[in-house]
């Protein structure tokens, strides 16, 4: 594929990445799949400025990001190292709370109304943010 040099229509560019902000809600897995079909991934937050950029665009609304611990340890969907990377959890989070009565704990991370992160039940229909890097090769065939 060709290298993407500008963001698709309705996506927002920031620091060599493109972001798309949903206005509807989906379960985490459906949101993850949506982004993959767009040749992107759920947003991976790697810095304070990226955190603030996303926060600025989503407002005080619960919104999925590309972080989960469904297979044990916390993992970013693009392979970014969780342990050494940026984190912005709310105090006392993540807590893998079982008291919600929906079965299981809480395995998916989202931005809360103040921008800080919480783990929640992956089936909750939250908004989501897709991200794709401008410099990566696009899956679209090059224009002739």
């Amino acid at each position: 594929g060709s290298e993407r040099t500008c963001c698709p229509v309705n996506w927002v560019e920031h620091e060599r990445s493109c972001y798309w902000f949903s206005r509807s809600g989906k379960a985490w897995a459906d949101a993850d799949n949506y982004c993959r079909l767009e040749d992107a991934h759920l947003v991976v937050v790697t810095s304070w400025e990226e955190q603030k950029f996303v926060q600025h665009h989503i407002g005080p609304v619960n919104t999925w990001m590309g972080l989960h611990d469904q297979n044990g340890p916390w993992k970013w969907v693009d392979g970014t190292d969780y342990e050494t990377g940026f984190k912005n959890w709310r105090p006392e989070q993540p807590d893998d709370w079982y008291g919600h009565g929906l079965g299981g704990g809480e395995d998916c991370a989202h931005f809360t109304d103040d921008g800080r992160w919480n783990d929640d039940v992956c089936q909750r229909p939250y908004r989501w943010v897709c991200e794709t890097e401008l410099d990566k090769a696009s899956q679209e065939p090059p224009l002739l």
Epitope: S47, W48, K52, K87, D113, D114
Partner: antibody
């Protein structure tokens, strides 16, 4: 009222260590990002380090990286700056400051500062 | 790292004067900029946050404007207690950086 009080400053020889403390009161310390900032004699303000509310992120100015360590004890409402391998150029007034949390929103910079504690590095 | 330049480095003014201080960032910082007042032996005091919002308790003669790389602090009518050194601070990304300061003294 919201208050930050620094302590631990003093005169120290180059190469030695010192630990500064910042006692917080009047707010929920564990919910706030905290900073250290310094001002050398006759110079401007210089940001030194920051620590997240839970200690999960720490960032440092290049001038102190590898020598200074920022930490906190939320049970004691206290912020620390461990300063090792001190240099003459570390001589300054050291301030602790709170990152604003306003209307459930972060990212407005430092809103509350302490009065500062003086560190003098001299042989 | 983001560099902050500030002008003028010092100025002499009289009570009642209108004073303008400019700060410029080496790259875009959105509106992640604050203005601080520093007096000897006292804690720094924030005057303006988010480039143009007045800190609670700060007199309305202080105002901030600008976005992107260039920002301005204006004191509409200088008062005796305003003689101090003023710093801008970018808190867009780490390391945070201050401008070199502007000393405002009595003419």
């Amino acid at each position: 009222q919201v208050q930050l009080v620094e302590s631990g400053g003093g005169v120290v020889q180059p190469g030695r260590s010192l630990r500064l403390s910042c006692a917080a009161s009047g707010f929920t310390f564990s919910s706030f990002i905290m900073h250290w900032v310094r001002q050398a004699p006759g110079r401007g303000l210089e940001w030194v380090a920051v620590i997240w509310y839970d200690g999960s992120n720490k960032y440092y100015a290049d001038s102190v990286k590898g020598r200074f360590t920022i930490s906190r004890d939320n049970s004691k409402n206290t912020l620390y700056l461990e300063m090792n391998s001190l240099r003459v150029e570390d001589t300054a007034v050291y301030y602790c400051a709170r990152e604003e949390y306003s209307s459930g929103w972060f990212g407005y910079g430092m809103d509350v500062w302490g009065q500062g504690t003086t560190v003098t590095v001299s042989s | 790292d983001i560099q902050m330049t500030q002008s003028p480095s010092s100025l002499s003014a009289s009570v009642g004067d209108r004073v303008t201080i400019t700060c410029r960032a080496s790259q875009g910082i959105r509106n992640d900029l604050g203005w601080y007042q520093l007096k000897p032996g006292k804690a720094p005091k924030r005057l303006i946050y988010a480039a143009s919002s007045l800190q609670s308790g700060v007199p309305s003669r202080f105002s901030g404007s600008g976005s992107g790389p260039e920002f301005t602090l204006t004191i509409s009518s200088l008062q005796p207690e305003d003689f101090a050194t003023y710093y801008c601070l970018q808190h867009y990304s780490f390391p945070f950086t201050f401008g070199p300061g502007t000393k405002v003294d009595i003419k």
